[in-house]
């Protein structure tokens, strides 16, 4: 007997172990989040439909009524009975859709009442027979394997009326007769048979909740009787096929069992884990245990449902046990919604397909699994641009791949659900599940591929997932004069040196009278000494941290409001300037060069002197003049020691502050640009000749990718995001002296259409000349890559002018604050800057990620490695003049995302050692790497190299 070959052992199953496995997922093993790999050779790729959902023609050519035809008429508010995709009429269009996808199989169901209108096997309805013959022959002509479901919920209404449907045992034999006819008629062309699709839902919603046809509810006993009869009907058909048809047709037969997945509230709680097991067993186990397990209902059910659950005799247990040649599994929205579809037992429903596959493996002895239905749904208004469906599919498919490759689950095929939009049961036409969009109101019912169809086609074509964006890691080193830095935000100056020890000449005794006070000893005078930089406690601390970092450069920002409290030169805080000079000089003693930012606004605090803030801040053009005076002071006081200046940190993010209207945003940005340019010219003319430094402004420069690569508007949105975010400042400075044409035109067009009242300011000829070329290098703060889509927005705000919406790709490695780790975005950004604005020196002035770990910050280490790798590729392969990399940031701030190498109370994290290694190696040298910086080779042209020689 065929089922004796079965290799299933170990009953009862051990599915509950899934929840207690606790694999301690590493935050940086990207393969645990997303696996770039291929599926096994000859993996079975398919797509499915259900007859009732797509065939239409509900009373055409002699078809009989089904329970669902009746249910629509009596229970559902459906405006049209002919709203389906009409596959019965448009077979050729379905075949073209299948050709497009490149699938190896098509899973469809036969409509029992289309073949036998009253449900009994007499003479088959000729037109129905002709349709299925044509479908099968056409599939085989295309080398597409048919996977045929005998029963996908459309019971002939006559059998419901006459016998009460599946409550009646008579249906077991009637179903077997129908199956026999199908085996006889189609079996020569069909190698894979499914008897019943998701019997759980037939019983639960058809006879329990009444959500499905025939719409009966309230009779718990009926629910389990129906389940019992469905099991026996399946079993009978399997034995029939096994005995009478398998020997010559050599096919396989199973039943599709559907389920949800559930996670315990508390992973460590045995009680919660048992509840999860109970939840799974009462849905999937109800049918799986008899067939794939020991032949009986799960113990949980037999104990709990004693009065309503029919019992199997020993003979029946033997009869039903093993009646599946593979495990056909369905995982989709029908098992998740509505919420009363499953017993949650107070635990958390989850879409983790990998976990449920592992549960099946453990519970039922690692069977071969065909995923017979998987997918999600979109709202009915979504047409071909089903972006979220791509992410859902990507996630599901990758979970399957991980189950196969990492967990040894024996999945041999996958059915994407569904080929077409169609009738979605209790949702009728309010949701869509097709890979192809069908307009149900159109006469021709064209099948238009959605983005998800393009995506699925790509996955099938590649038999898995290729990491197209990334390139292999390189071995190699950065140039000798490369700046390895760390960035800190504003350094608040200490008003006085923290210790009076060397400025007060008196001697004190502590606690002489037991009052815990200092008492001056009269008549004794000590020698004092001048204040030293190291008297500043914060500087001492900083130097300690910087020395541990082993960096060559330290980027920090001055506090404008501290240096010039009144905003003009009438009151200069000399102590603050002395503090900053100390920071620089002490750093230089350790061979740590400064990169100084003059102005570092933050979301919470604009960092402007109070009088400037009160007179309008950056909305007042006179602030630019005040900034020039402040910058001039800093150049005079610190410029002999500082060779790299940043005027303004992330002026393109000031929109977060000046966001009352877009015109405020654009005006503030305009004034910032002019202020920067004035300062650049001041430095260029007055200070560069003697100080020989370089000056720029640093831009927040995240890369953007289309959320949906199959939709032109998303590509345009990605480019538009870059125009509004980076080109907004880069174009005037590095190219034309004016704002990007694309940005100007986009805003103007929205304003013309009444969608915005934004106006981008105009530069005068003098201002254009002033701004153009007013930066010596690119200073890029790059953290992540954003996935963007087009979404038209009304209103006069900078954010809405862009018509951009962000999406999170759930399959990507991301930080706690949801920053995606996508190193190749950095490479793309560097190339984009060079291609658009020319071959300038580049400094990555901030690059980092938040990591929750207080000590072993693995995510940060992984991030550092990968992003520095991209910088190295940009240098070695793209020949980009990358001069420095500044990791972000030195210390973290309390109650903010954790970006620091040191905690807010100065505790070191392990990423410091990792960064040390990168710095010491100057990159990623090979074992027998080329010449190092301290070796004479040719005529090196960098001062650092010459100093080292």
């Amino acid at each position: 007997d065929y089922k004796d070959d079965d290799d299933k052992l170990d009953f009862p199953g051990d599915g509950r172990a899934v929840w207690s496995q606790n694999p301690n997922l590493s935050p940086v093993n990207e393969s645990q989040l997303f696996l770039y790999d291929t599926f096994p050779k000859n993996f079975f790729w398919g797509v499915g439909t259900g007859a009732f959902q797509v065939e239409g023609s509900w009373k055409k050519d002699g078809k009989g009524l089904s329970v669902w035809d009746h249910f629509i008429a009596t229970h559902l508010n459906v405006s049209s009975r002919d709203g389906s995709s009409d596959s019965y009429i448009f077979l050729e269009k379905d075949l073209s859709a299948l050709d497009f996808l490149g699938v190896s199989f098509y899973q469809f169901s036969i409509s029992w009442p289309r073949l036998f209108p009253d449900g009994t096997v007499a003479v088959a309805n000729a037109k129905g027979l002709q349709y299925y013959n044509r479908l099968l022959d056409s599939l085989l002509l295309r080398n597409i394997e048919p996977v045929v479901t005998l029963y996908h919920w459309d019971l002939p209404w006559a059998l419901q009326e006459k016998y009460g449907g599946w409550k009646n045992e008579t249906l077991i034999d009637l179903f077997n007769d129908y199956a026999t006819y199908c085996f006889q008629t189609f079996g020569d062309r069909v190698k894979y048979w499914i008897t019943i699709h998701n019997p759980y839902l037939v019983a639960w919603h058809g006879y329990g909740t009444g959500l499905h046809a025939p719409g009966e509810k309230g009779n718990v006993a009926a629910v389990y009787t129906v389940g019992h009869n469905l099991l026996k009907a399946h079993s009978k058909v399997w034995h029939n096929y096994n005995r009478n048809f398998r020997p010559h047709q050599k096919g396989w037969l199973s039943i599709t069992l559907g389920s949800h997945w559930i996670e315990p509230n508390r992973a460590e709680s045995i009680v919660d884990i048992l509840k999860c097991q109970q939840s799974m067993v009462s849905v999937l186990g109800w049918f799986a245990n008899p067939i794939h397990g020991d032949g009986d209902y799960p113990e949980v059910m037999t104990k709990k449902l004693l009065s309503v659950l029919p019992a199997f005799s020993e003979a029946e247990k033997n009869e039903v046990r093993g009646t599946a040649d593979f495990f056909a599994f369905s995982f989709g929205p029908n098992n998740f919604k509505p919420l009363n579809t499953m017993a949650k037992m107070g635990q958390n429903v989850s879409l983790n397909l990998r976990q449920v596959l592992n549960w099946i493996k453990l519970e039922y002895g690692n069977p071969r699994i065909l995923i017979a239905e998987n997918g999600w749904f979109t709202d009915s208004y979504v047409q071909t641009e089903d972006t979220t469906a791509i992410y859902m599919m990507k996630n599901f498919l990758n979970q399957v791949l991980q189950a196969i490759r990492l967990d040894g689950v024996r999945v041999f095929g996958y059915t994407a659900w569904s080929l077409l939009d169609g009738f979605e049961w209790q949702d009728a036409y309010n949701t869509r599940r097709g890979l192809f969009y069908v307009d149900f109101n159109s006469e021709q019912r064209e099948r238009r591929p959605k983005s998800s169809a393009h995506y699925y086609k790509q996955v099938i074509g590649e038999n898995g997932f290729t990491l197209r964006e990334a390139t292999p890691d390189l071995q190699g080193q950065f140039p000798c004069d490369f700046s390895w830095g760390v960035t800190e935000s504003v350094l608040k100056p200490e008003s006085v040196a923290s210790s009076p020890q060397f400025s007060d000449p008196h001697l004190y005794v502590w606690n002489a009278t037991g009052n815990r006070m200092l008492h001056r000893v009269e008549g004794v005078r000590l020698k004092t000494r001048p204040a030293q930089c190291t008297d500043f406690i914060t500087i001492k601390k900083q130097l300690e941290m910087l020395a541990r970092m082993k960096v060559t450069h330290f980027r920090f920002a001055l506090d404008w409001a501290s240096v010039l409290p009144t905003g003009n030169l009438s009151e200069v805080n000399r102590q603050a300037l002395r503090y900053y000079r100390c920071v620089v000089t002490e750093g230089l003693k350790l061979n740590i060069s400064p990169m100084v930012t003059l102005y570092y606004p933050t979301h919470a605090h604009l960092g402007l002197p109070a009088p400037l803030l009160h007179s309008g801040g950056w909305l007042d053009p006179s602030t630019a003049k005040a900034f020039r005076d402040y910058a001039g002071l800093c150049f005079r006081e610190l410029g002999d020691l500082v060779k790299l200046w940043i005027t303004i940190n992330e002026p393109n993010r000031l929109s977060d502050v000046y966001n009352r209207t877009s015109n405020d945003t654009y005006q503030a940005a305009h004034n910032l640009l002019i202020a920067h340019a004035i300062v650049w010219h001041l430095y260029d003319r007055q200070y560069r000749p003697s100080q020989r430094g370089a000056l720029s402004l640093s831009l927040h420069s995240d890369w953007a990718e289309p959320a949906n690569p199959y939709v032109a508007s998303h590509w345009q949105a990605a480019e538009r995001f870059l125009q509004f975010e980076i080109a907004w400042f880069a174009e005037p400075l590095f190219k034309t002296g004016d704002y990007p044409v694309a940005m100007r035109e986009y805003i103007a067009s929205k304003t013309r259409r009444g969608l915005s009242s934004s106006v981008l300011p105009r530069f005068s000829d003098a201002e254009r000349r002033l701004v153009k070329g007013a930066a010596d290098f690119y200073a890029l703060n790059h953290f992540t890559t954003r996935f963007v889509m087009h979404e038209q927005q009304n209103g006069s705000r900078y954010d809405s002018d862009r018509d951009v919406q962000f999406l999170q790709d759930i399959t990507r490695l991301a930080s706690p604050s949801r920053l995606a780790v996508m190193p190749w975005g950095e490479g793309k950004l560097l190339r984009w800057m060079r291609n658009n604005y020319g071959d300038l020196d580049v400094y990555i002035t901030a690059n980092g990620i938040d990591d929750q770990a207080l000590q072993n910050d693995q995510l940060r280490q992984y991030y550092l490695e990968k992003y520095v790798q991209e910088a190295l590729k940009a240098y070695l392969i793209d020949k980009i003049k990358i001069k420095g990399y500044y990791a972000f940031k030195l210390t973290e701030e309390k109650s903010k995302p954790r970006f620091g190498f040191f905690t807010s109370d100065f505790k070191a994290k392990s990423s410091i050692q990792f960064y040390n290694k990168l710095i010491t190696s100057n990159g990623f040298p090979s074992e027998n790497g080329g010449p190092r910086c301290n070796q004479t080779q040719g005529n090196p042209e960098c001062t650092v190299c010459l100093l080292l020689l």
Epitope: R468, T471, P472, L876, K879, K881, G930, Q937
Partner: antibody, heavy 116, light 107 residues
Framework: EVKFLESGGGLVQPGGSLRLSCAVS????????MSWVRQAPGKGLEWIGE????????NYTPSLKDKFVISRDNAKNTLYLQMSKVRSADTALYYC?????????WGQGTLVTVSA | DIVMTQSPATLSVTPGDRVSLSCRAS??????VYWYQQKSHESPRLLII???QSISGIPSRFSGSGSGSDFTLSINSVEPEDVGVYYC?????????FGGGTKLEIK
């Protein structure tokens, strides 16, 4: 105007050595990577190697690594290719070019003939 | 080493024709492919970088496409002065190998 001018080619005996030079003008030589590419008579192009602006990184095609040395003198705006242990297969037109990253500026080439 | 295979080796065309020259890499090289034109007795000239980005000063009839391992250089409407040999180059992994070239000639 950007100019790359190769020199130093000529007839050389098998097993012998030769140093090719490439004088560069019209660009800030010290800021750019430089490459050598060769083309045997009637054949296609073969990438020889490249050198970084500060000479800290030099990449070669593996088969030529042991017989060719690329160097540069930024003070003289000159790129060099030192060839040793030459064979008849090394007969070719030798071009210097700037990779940024594709080879956007080329010299006219200098012909090296290896023959007894 | 990455092997770049160009096809066809020779292409005879009529002025005004649209032609496609193929280049296949032995492994995926993202979009790191550069195309050059070399006319008789001249140094090569750069046409396309990063598989599809055109170079200023190059006639707009030249365009590139592809990513991964299959790349195409297209000439929209061939002019007599387009005769010469066209090379693709891998710009992704050392050594930066060239294809064997496709010779374009006018019938």
């Amino acid at each position: 105007e950007v100019k790359f001018l190769e020199s130093g080619g000529g007839l050389v005996q098998p097993g012998g050595s030769l140093r090719l030079s490439c004088a560069v003008s019209g660009i800030d030589f010290s800021r750019y990577w430089m490459s050598w590419v060769r083309q045997a008579p009637g054949k296609g192009l073969e990438w020889i190697g490249e050198i970084s602006p500060d000479s800290s990184t030099i990449n070669y095609t593996p088969s030529l690594k042991d017989k060719f040395v690329i160097s540069r003198d930024n003070a003289k705006n000159t790129l060099y290719l030192q060839m040793s242990k030459v064979r008849s297969a090394d007969t070719a037109l030798y071009y210097c070019a700037r990779p940024s990253p594709a080879l956007d500026y080329w010299g006219q080439g200098t012909l090296v003939t290896v023959s007894a | 080493d990455i092997v770049m295979t160009q096809s066809p080796a020779t292409l005879s065309v009529t002025p005004g024709d649209r032609v496609s020259l193929s280049c296949r890499a032995s492994q995926s090289i993202s979009d790191y492919v550069y195309w050059y034109q070399q006319k008789s007795h001249e140094s090569p000239r750069l046409l396309i970088i990063y598989a599809s980005q055109s170079i200023s000063g190059i006639p707009s009839r030249f365009s590139g496409s592809g990513s991964g391992s299959d790349f195409t250089l297209s000439i929209n409407s061939v002019e007599p002065e387009d005769v010469g040999v066209y090379y693709c180059q891998n710009g992704h992994n050392f050594p930066y190998t060239f294809g064997g070239g496709t010779k374009l000639e006018i019938k």
